[in-house]
């Protein structure tokens, strides 16, 4: 249904509050370096213009596309060339090329200062003094640091952020009330950002077909009682929503997500028995709840897959008539029977099935050729099962910190060219798979672990893409979306790597380490560990453990000393010398 004015249509659908918030997010995700005040000014101008279009859809410029209106507005920023360099060249282009150009300049690792949390009283005062500005600032700071954050979900986070301050700033012990809530929002926010980044990478790097396959598998696991046609409709709608959000079309995305939630709730009887509670919630909570809803129970009388996909004489006929529909049905039928498999494993199985049919349907006796196709699935299933079993055993033996360290060493040896901060960040996140997934029973471990690892390895891929330094990373990231994890798992020590020159400065520590939080102290130690491996890639686990134990003892000793700085200087020299000797540097 065509609207005379797209901007008026979205303003009316979303309401002024959501409209302004989404425009702010869109602008902050495009122009990540612009000051908050500049963005607020641009948003207010767009909002005032939208109101004129609501009053009269035929008014001047109201018929323009949102990309044209928003792009024109962004291109009025005076300091565009000084602040963003070649991104300013986007403004010389016409739509849709201009928007594509802005998208290509989104920076996954913007050079922005770390967000430092002020004192609780300071935050509460700011919240009470100007609630609207306080919440806008939250949207702005998150959006510019996470340029692919799922915008409608960020509105949900902002609503929870507001609720936390509303409740806790009145509490007797403000800090005890507020800080855990803010920690939870921060951690959930990072996870949400990373999950959405994978969806956008899937769409942008591997195309709509790859995303739809992922969605068929995931929704079939979640809604195993739904018919294939129903799942297909949901997949089509969900693909549209994520394509829009990943493409910067945040107003359309939020509007369509609301429509999808409405449809799901109106049709929950034919989708899932688990949706009832979600559908009683307000819009933002409802959409979030649906996205996180637990898998419904499997129907009790599902026949074997073999009948339709191996034994039937019509396999090749059905495949030839509509390849993607037939493969989609295979994926749907397999996934609804296997909530215990990761989505990426299900996609590998579907790819194997497709490859077998491509080969066999051209053979003299197709049925004889594909009769044993399920045999090919066995190694594909057992590989992640065995890997998860081994790593959960290691995690249970070591605990999270030491498990992260084992992964740091493993990944630094695989891809030593990658920057130390990236290796630390990615390995720490990989290590979190232990506490996140190993507590689950066997039937829930693989979907938890392997799909989480896909999200984390995508972080490595997008960070590496910005400044590529390793052919091996590029290869694993670009060849196959579903085989990224097996590709990285299969990498051995990089024998071509020339060890980094030893630099004592890298291993010089000061008294400031004593005032750091436990997490920040761990990061310092893990940074040193990565650097050690880069200097001595052939060092054994035992050698590295000895050096790290000495290092931990050194930090503990000097942090207890009266003259901390002198201790760090003198004992630090001894530690470097001892470490060099221990590692044969």
């Amino acid at each position: 249904d065509a609207h005379k004015s797209e901007v008026a249509h979205r303003f009316k659908d979303l309401g002024e509050e959501n409209f302004k918030a989404l425009v702010l997010i869109a602008f902050a995700q495009y122009l990540q370096q612009c000051p908050f005040e500049d963005h607020v000014k641009l948003v207010n101008e767009v909002t005032e213009f939208a109101k004129t279009c609501v009053a009269d859809e035929s008014a001047e410029n109201c018929d323009k596309s949102l990309h044209t209106l928003f792009g024109d507005k962004l291109c009025t920023v005076a300091t565009l060339r000084e602040t963003y360099g070649e991104m300013a060249d986007c403004c010389a282009k016409q739509e849709p090329e201009r928007n594509e150009c802005f998208l290509q300049h989104k920076d996954d690792n913007p050079n922005l200062p770390r967000l430092v949390r002020p004192e609780v009283d300071v935050m509460c005062t700011a919240f009470h003094d100007n609630e609207e500005t306080f919440l806008k600032k939250y949207l702005y700071e998150i959006a510019r640091r996470h340029p692919y954050f799922y915008a409608p979900e960020l509105l949900f986070f902002a609503k929870r952020y507001k609720a936390a301050f509303t409740e806790c700033c009145q509490a007797a012990d403000k800090a005890a009330c507020l800080l855990p809530k803010l920690d939870e929002l921060r951690d959930e926010g990072k996870a949400s950002s990373a999950k959405q980044r994978l969806k956008c990478a899937s769409l942008q790097k591997f195309g709509e077909r790859a995303f739809k396959a992922w969605a068929v598998a995931r929704l079939s696991q979640r809604f195993p009682k739904a018919e294939f046609a129903e799942v297909s409709k949901l997949v089509t709608d969900l693909t549209k929503v994520h394509t829009e959000c990943c493409h910067g079309d945040l107003l359309e995305c939020a509007d369509d997500r609301a429509d999808l939630a409405k449809y799901i709730c109106e049709n929950q009887d034919s989708i899932s028995s688990k949706l009832k509670e979600c559908c009683e919630k307000p819009l933002l909570e409802k959409s979030h709840c649906i996205a996180e809803v637990e898998n419904d129970e499997m129907p009790a009388d599902l026949p074997s897959l073999a009948a339709d996909f191996v034994e039937s004489k019509d396999v090749c006929k059905n495949y030839a008539e509509a390849k993607d529909v037939f493969l989609g049905m295979f994926l749907y039928e397999y996934a609804r029977r296997h909530p215990d498999y990761s989505v990426v494993l299900l996609l590998r199985l579907a790819k194997t099935y497709e490859t077998t049919l491509e080969k066999c349907c051209a053979a003299a006796d197709p049925h004889e050729c594909y009769a044993k196709v399920f045999d090919e699935f066995k190694p594909l299933v057992e590989e992640p099962q065995n890997l998860i079993k081994q790593n959960c055993e290691l995690f249970e033996q070591l605990g999270e910190y030491k498990f992260q360290n084992a992964l740091l060493v493993r990944y630094t040896k695989k891809v030593p060219q990658v920057s130390t901060p990236t290796l630390v960040e990615v390995s720490r996140n990989l290590g979190k798979v232990g506490s996140k997934c190993c507590k689950h029973p066997e039937a829930k471990r693989m979907p938890c672990a392997e799909d989480y690892l896909s999200v984390v390895l995508n972080q490595l891929c997008v960070l590496h893409e910005k400044t590529p330094v390793s052919d091996r990373v590029t290869k694993c990231c670009t060849e196959s979306l579903v085989n990224r994890r097996p590709c990285f798992s299969a990498l051995e020590v990089d024998e071509t790597y020339v060890p980094k020159e030893f630099n004592a400065e890298t291993f010089t520590f000061h008294a400031d380490i004593c005032t750091l939080s436990e997490k920040e102290r761990q990061i310092k130690k893990q940074t040193a560990l990565v650097e050690l491996v880069k200097h001595k890639p052939k060092a054994t686990k035992e050698q590295l453990k000895a050096v790290m134990d000495d290092f931990a003892a050194f930090v503990e000793k000097c942090c207890k000393a009266d003259d901390k700085e002198t201790c760090f200087a003198e004992e630090g020299k001894k530690l470097v010398a001892a470490s060099q000797a221990a590692l044969g540097l």
Epitope: P303, S304, A306, R337, H338, D375, F377, E382
Partner: nanobody
């Protein structure tokens, strides 16, 4: 490789009940769909029923629906066939079958046991 050993067969009167067991060794059955086939005297082998990896889904031949129940205990690596209201036409050798990841059928399975004789008089 997985080895399957059936037990619990024997002679039973029409209308009676019998419980067959299938014990697996050499592998964990939680990765396998399990099922039962049977072959009556002078008859073709036929599908009895199957159960998926976690016991959530079962599928039965029309001839046994409502009388036979398949269950599994993954911790014990064992699958069961509870046969009630037995009829003379249920007589035959009952085979336990396993198929990796999906439920087995008459034609599609990875492993099959030696069978156990059931006679309904």
């Amino acid at each position: 490789d997985v080895q399957l050993v059936e037990s619990g067969g024997g002679l039973v009167q029409a209308g009676g009940s019998l419980r067959l067991s299938c014990a697996a060794s050499g592998g964990t059955i939680s990765n396998y769909g399990m099922g039962w086939l049977r072959q009556g005297p002078g008859k073709e082998r036929e599908f009895v029923g199957s159960i998926n990896w976690n016991g959530a889904t079962t599928h039965y031949a029309d001839s046994v629906k409502g009388r036979f129940i398949i269950s599994r205990d993954n911790a014990k690596n064992t699958v069961y066939l509870q046969m009630n209201s037995l009829k003379p036409e249920d007589t035959g050798v009952y085979y336990c079958v396993a198929q990796f990841s999906v439920q087995p059928t008459l034609q599609t399975y990875d492993y099959r046991g030696q069978g156990t004789q059931v006679t309904v008089s």
